[in-house]
Interface confidence: low
C-alpha cells in the first residue's frame, strides 16, 4: 500500500501565505487591516525608524529560539564525577586563607580518565553542597588562571536557608580548557562578592567539605558530598561514529536552500506584503523571508531486519520517537514591523515569524 | 469532503513504544540490547546510585527545554524607548563621581506612560552605546535600590574594540518593579568589577552620553544615542482580551491529563522497560512517563466570513501559520539511566525523552 502523494508546492505556499495573513492580524488583535486614511505622507519619522532599527538590532544580536542541537546532543552522554582533591593536600597551603574565599582543587589526570578528549565533553558542572545560611549572600566563582591569578566565571545570589542544598555552576568551558592543557592540578575559588565601594565582605555560606573556620580541614560530613565535578561526555568508542559520519544535518537555510533534499527541510518563501497579501498598511519592512517546513519524516519500524542501519536513521527522521513524526519549525525568529493607527506610528514585534530551521518531531 | 479519521489509540501507543525502543538503542549507538551475562548480582553500587541521583537532581532543577510560552507571548509587543534623563538633571549631583562607576537615571513617569501596568511588560533592555575600549574590561550593572544603596544585577566581560557597539542588558524584572512602585526617578550604575583582593579598578569603557571625565555632561555625539530603555509591552487595549478570555491553554500534563480535550494535547504513556519492551538491562529507572502528542490542529482559512472569530483560533490551532499544522512536543525533558556494559555500570543521560507539553506547529 503506497501512501505517496505528489505535493502541490503552490497550494502549500498559498496556504502558508493565507495563514500568515491571519497570523499577523491575530497577533495584533485586529479583525481587519487598519484604515490608512489619516497616515501622513512622506517617509517615517526619524525617531520611529531609530526605534524600528533598535528592535531589528536586538533580533540580529540574539535569536529568539535556542540554536538547533548539534548531532552529538542527540546521543546519550556518559555521566561521571570527579571529587575535589582532599583539603590536606599541600596545594591548599599555597593559597592564603581569607575570610572572603574558599578554594577547591581538582586532579586533571582524573578528569582526563573520565573524558579523554576535550571535544567529547558535553557539560561539566561544579556541584557544592551548601549547608545552612543565615543571611542572603552574593558569591562569585573564579577559575585558577596562572600562578596566582584568578579569572572571574560567574556569580550567584544565595537566599537564606536552614536546610542543605546543592549548588551547581556550569563550568564546561573551563574543564574543556583544563583537558586541553598540561597542568596537573587546577582549581576554583568561591568568594564573597565585593563591590568597589564595600570591600569588607565575608563569605558567610558554609560549603560541605570545609570547616566553618575555613582552615581547609575536611568536615566530618560524608566525604562523598564534598565539592565535585559532574561530567557528561560522549564515550570515546561512540565518538568515532560522530566524526566519521555526520548523519544528522541541521535542516536550516544554509543546508536546505542549497540542496535538493526531498525529506523534511526548510523551504524558501519571501512574502511581499503588497504583492502577496495586498497590504499597504505595513510601512516597514516591505516584506520578509517567512519560509516554511516541508518534506516527509518517515516512521521507522525498529523491528526491521536491517536493524543497525535503521537505528542510524532515528537521529534524522524521528529523534523524538513519535508515532507519526512531522516536519515542523525548530528555530524561529521574530519580526519587527512599523504600521500606523490613525496618525500614530507604532513599532511592534511579532514573535516566531521567520522559520530558520526545521526538524522531524 | 470530510477527512475525519477515527484514531486507533492502541496502534498509536504501540507505534510510540516501538519508536522508543529504537530511540534508546540509537541514542546509545547499540545495535541490540547489551548482554547481561557478566552483570554482578545484588543492588547497584552506592557510588553509582549517588551519581544517578546527582543526574536526576540536575534534571529536576532545570528543565532541558524552555517553558512553553504564555499566551501573552503569542501577541505582538509594542516597542517604545525611554531615554536616560539628561545628565544636567540635579539627580546626578546626589551621587558622588568616582573613577569606577557611571550613573544612569530614568523618569518613571515616562516608563508608566509607555507601559501603564507592570504585568503588560514583556521585556525591558538597557541599551548603552559603548565607544572605543583599549583593554578588556569586566563591568557590573547595579540597580538603585533604596536611598543610597545599590543591588547587583549582572555583569559582562567586554572585549577590546575600536568601533562603537551597542550593549544590551536584560532589566525586565527591575523595570517591572519600578512600574509597581511609587518612585519618580530610578537608576542604574555601571561599575568596574572589583574583587575582594584588587580594589583599584577604573571603569575604562566609554559609554556614549558621558564625557570621558565622567563629569556627567552629555557628550556631543547625537543625544538619541545616549543610554535608553527599550521596552516591549502588550498595549493596554490588547491586554483586556488576555484577562477576559484565556483562549490559549498550555497543552501540558496539568491540563491535558485532566481534560477530555479532543484537539492537540499531551497524552499519558508510561513505559515499563520490562513489560512494554521486554528489557531487563536498564537497572534504573524501572520505567518512565514518556507520554506523546496527539490530536488535530485544524488549518484555518483566514478568508473565512466569521473573520474576528477565526482570528481568535490562530493562537491555539496554528500559531506558527503553518500550511499543515501538526501536534508535536513542545517541552521535553531528559532521562538518566543506569545499565551495565559487561561488569561495568554506566550512568547515561538521554536527551529529550519525556514529553511534558505539546503544541500545534
Amino acid at each position: 500500500l503506497s501512501t505517496c502523494k505528489t505535493i502541490d508546492m503552490e497550494l502549500v505556499k498559498r496556504k502558508r501565505i493565507e495563514a500568515i495573513r491571519g497570523q499577523i492580524l491575530s497577533k495584533l488583535r485586529l479583525a481587519s487591516p487598519p484604515s490608512q486614511g489619516e497616515v501622513p505622507p512622506g517617509p517615517l519619522p526619524e525617531a520611529v525608524l531609530a526605534l524600528y532599527n533598535s528592535t531589528r538590532d536586538r533580533v540580529a544580536g540574539e535569536s529568539a529560539e535556542p540554536e538547533p542541537e548539534p548531532e552529538a546532543d542527540y546521543y546519550a552522554k556518559e555521566v561521571t564525577r570527579v571529587l575535589m582533591v582532599e583539603t590536606h593536600n599541600e596545594i591548599y597551603d599555597k593559597f592564603k586563607q581569607s575570610t572572603h574565599s574558599i578554594y577547591m582543587f581538582f586532579n586533571t589526570s582524573e578528569l582526563r580518565e573520565a573524558v579523554p578528549e576535550p571535544v567529547l565533553l558535553s557539560r561539566a558542572e561544579l556541584r557544592l553542597l551548601r549547608l545552612k545560611l543565615k543571611v542572603e549572600q552574593h558569591v562569585e566563582l573564579y577559575q585558577k588562571y596562572s600562578n596566582n591569578s584568578w579569572r572571574y566565571l560567574s556569580n550567584r545570589l544565595l537566599a537564606p536557608s536552614d536546610s542543605p542544598e546543592w549548588l551547581s555552576f556550569d563550568v564546561t568551558g573551563v574543564v574543556r580548557q583544563w583537558l586541553s592543557r598540561g597542568g596537573e592540578i587546577e582549581g576554583f575559588r568561591l568568594s564573597a562578592h565585593c563591590s568597589c565601594d564595600s570591600r569588607d565582605n565575608t563569605l558567610q555560606v558554609d560549603i560541605n567539605g570545609f570547616t566553618t573556620g575555613r582552615r581547609g580541614d575536611l568536615a566530618t560530613i560524608h566525604g562523598m558530598n564534598r565539592p565535585f565535578l559532574l561530567l557528561m561526555a560522549t564515550p570515546l568508542e561512540r565518538a568515532q561514529h560522530l566524526q566519521s559520519s555526520r548523519h544528522r544535518r541541521a535542516l536550516d537555510t544554509n543546508y536546505c536552500f542549497s540542496s535538493t533534499e526531498k525529506n523534511c527541510c526548510v523551504r524558501q518563501l519571501y512574502i511581499d506584503f503588497r504583492k502577496d497579501l495586498g497590504w499597504k498598511w505595513i510601512h516597514e519592512p516591505k516584506g520578509y523571508h517567512a519560509n516554511f517546513c516541508l518534506g516527509p519524516c518517515p516512521y521507522i519500524w525498529s523491528l526491521d531486519t536491517q536493524y543497525s542501519k535503521v537505528l542510524a536513521l532515528y537521529n534524522q527522521h524521528n529523534p523524538g520517537a513519535s508515532a507519526a513524526p512531522c516536519c515542523v519549525p525548530q528555530a524561529l525568529e521574530p519580526l519587527p514591523i512599523v504600521y500606523y493607527v490613525g496618525r500614530k506610528p507604532k513599532v511592534e514585534q511579532l514573535s516566531n515569524m521567520i522559520v530558520r530551521s526545521c526538524k522531524c518531531s | 469532503l470530510s477527512t475525519c479519521k477515527t484514531i486507533d489509540m492502541e496502534l498509536v501507543k504501540r507505534k510510540r513504544i516501538e519508536a522508543i525502543r529504537g530511540q534508546i538503542l540509537s541514542k546509545l549507538r547499540l545495535a541490540s540490547p547489551p548482554s547481561q551475562g557478566e552483570v554482578p548480582p545484588g543492588p547497584l553500587p552506592e557510588a553509582v546510585l549517588a551519581l544517578y541521583n546527582s543526574t536526576r537532581d540536575r534534571v529536576a532543577g532545570e528543565s532541558a527545554e524552555p517553558e512553553p510560552e504564555p499566551e501573552a507571548d503569542y501577541y505582538a509587543k509594542e516597542v517604545t524607548r525611554v531615554l536616560m534623563v539628561e545628565t544636567h538633571n540635579e539627580i546626578y549631583d546626589k551621587f558622588k563621581q568616582s573613577t569606577h562607576s557611571i550613573y544612569m537615571f530614568f523618569n518613571t513617569s515616562e516608563l508608566r506612560e509607555a507601559v501603564p501596568e507592570p504585568v503588560l511588560l514583556s521585556r525591558a533592555e538597557l541599551r548603552l552605546l559603548r565607544l572605543k575600549l583599549k583593554v578588556e574590561q569586566h563591568v557590573e550593572l547595579y540597580q538603585k535600590y533604596s536611598n543610597n544603596s545599590w543591588r547587583y544585577l549582572s555583569n559582562r566581560l567586554l572585549a577590546p574594540s575600536d568601533s562603537p557597539e551597542w550593549l544590551s542588558f536584560d532589566v525586565t524584572g527591575v523595570v517591572r518593579q519600578w512600574l509597581s512602585r511609587g518612585g519618580e526617578i530610578e537608576g542604574f550604575r555601571l561599575s568596574a568589577h572589583c574583587s575582594c583582593d584588587s580594589r583599584d579598578n577604573t571603569l575604562q569603557v566609554d559609554i556614549n552620553g558621558f564625557t570621558t571625565g565622567r563629569r556627567g555632561d552629555l557628550a556631543t555625539i547625537h543625544g538619541m544615542n545616549r543610554p535608553f530603555l527599550l521596552l516591549m509591552a502588550t498595549p493596554l487595549e490588547r491586554a483586556q482580551h488576555l484577562q477576559s478570555s484565556r483562549h490559549r491553554r498550555a497543552l501540558d500534563t496539568n491540563y491535558c491529563f485532566s481534560s477530555t480535550e479532543k484537539n492537540c494535547c499531551v497524552r499519558q504513556l508510561y513505559i515499563d522497560f520490562r513489560k512494554d519492551l521486554g528489557w531487563k538491562w536498564i537497572h534504573e529507572p524501572k520505567g518512565y512517563h514518556a507520554n506523546f502528542c496527539l490530536g488535530p490542529c485544524p488549518y484555518i482559512w483566514s478568508l473565512d466570513t466569521q473573520y474576528s472569530k477565526v482570528l481568535a483560533l490562530y493562537n491555539q490551532h496554528n500559531p506558527g501559520a503553518s500550511a499543515a499544522p501538526c501536534c508535536v512536543p513542545q517541552a521535553l525533558e531528559p532521562l538518566p539511566i543506569v545499565y551495565y556494559v559487561g561488569r561495568k555500570p554506566k550512568v547515561e543521560q538521554l536527551s529529550n525523552m519525556i514529553v511534558r507539553s505539546c503544541k500545534c506547529s
Partner: antibody
Framework: QVQLVESGGGVVQPGRSLRLSCAAS????????MNWIRQPPGKGLEWIGY???????YRANWARGRFTISRDNSKNTLYLQMNSLRAEDTAVYYC????????????????WGQGTLVTVSS | DIQMTQSPSSLSASVGDRVTITCQAS??????LAWYQQKPGQPPKLLIY???TLEYGVPSRFSGSGSGTDFTLTISSLQPEDFATYYC??????????FGQGTKVEIK
Amino acid sequence: QVQLVESGGGVVQPGRSLRLSCAASGFHFSSEAMNWIRQPPGKGLEWIGYIYTSGTTYRANWARGRFTISRDNSKNTLYLQMNSLRAEDTAVYYCARGWHIFDHHYWVMHAWGQGTLVTVSS
Amino acid sequence: DIQMTQSPSSLSASVGDRVTITCQASQSISTYLAWYQQKPGQPPKLLIYAASTLEYGVPSRFSGSGSGTDFTLTISSLQPEDFATYYCQSYSDGDSVIFGQGTKVEIK
C-alpha cells in the same frame, strides 16, 4: 475629518469651579493623547497639561493644584476640571490632539478645537 | 523649567519678503521643537515639528532649522495669507510643554 469641539465655558465668579468638555470625532480617540492649552485675551499660548491613552496625566507646574484632566474613552470626550478660579484664569481654552512619536514626549498639537471662552469675574 | 525666548516679538514685512523668526531654548532640547501659526479668532495650526519636518499640507515656503538651543523658522517668500502670529514650542520633557511668547508678522 478630525473634529474637536470644546464646551462648558462662560462667565464664572472667582473661587468657583467649572468643568470644560471636548468632544472628539473623526479619529480613534482612545489611542491618542490629548492636551489642554489656554490663551488669555491678547496674550500667548499656555500649555495646561495632557492625558495619555491610559489616563496618566501631566500638568504644567502652575496647574497642578487646581486643574484636573480626565477622559471618557467610551464617550470620546476629554474633560478639564478647574477649581478655585481666579481672574487671571480668564482665557480661551483649547483642547488639542497630541501626536506621540516614540522616544521622548513628542507632544506636537496637530489638531485643535475652536476653543471656549472662560471669563472669571465678579 | 526650560524657557523659550522668541525674537523678534513683532516684525513688519512685505509680500515676497524672506522672513526669519528665531527661538532660543534655555537648555538643549535636541530637535524637539514645533512651530505654529495663529490667525486672529482661530486656533493655532501646526507648521513644523521635529525642528525641520514640514507638516502635511503646509506650503514648502515654510522651513525650519536648528538643534540644541537655537532654532529658526523661515518663510522664503511671504504671502498675504502668512500675516499672523507664530509660536515655537518645545516638547523635550515629559513634564512640560513650553510655548514661546509669539512673533507677530504684520504688513509693512
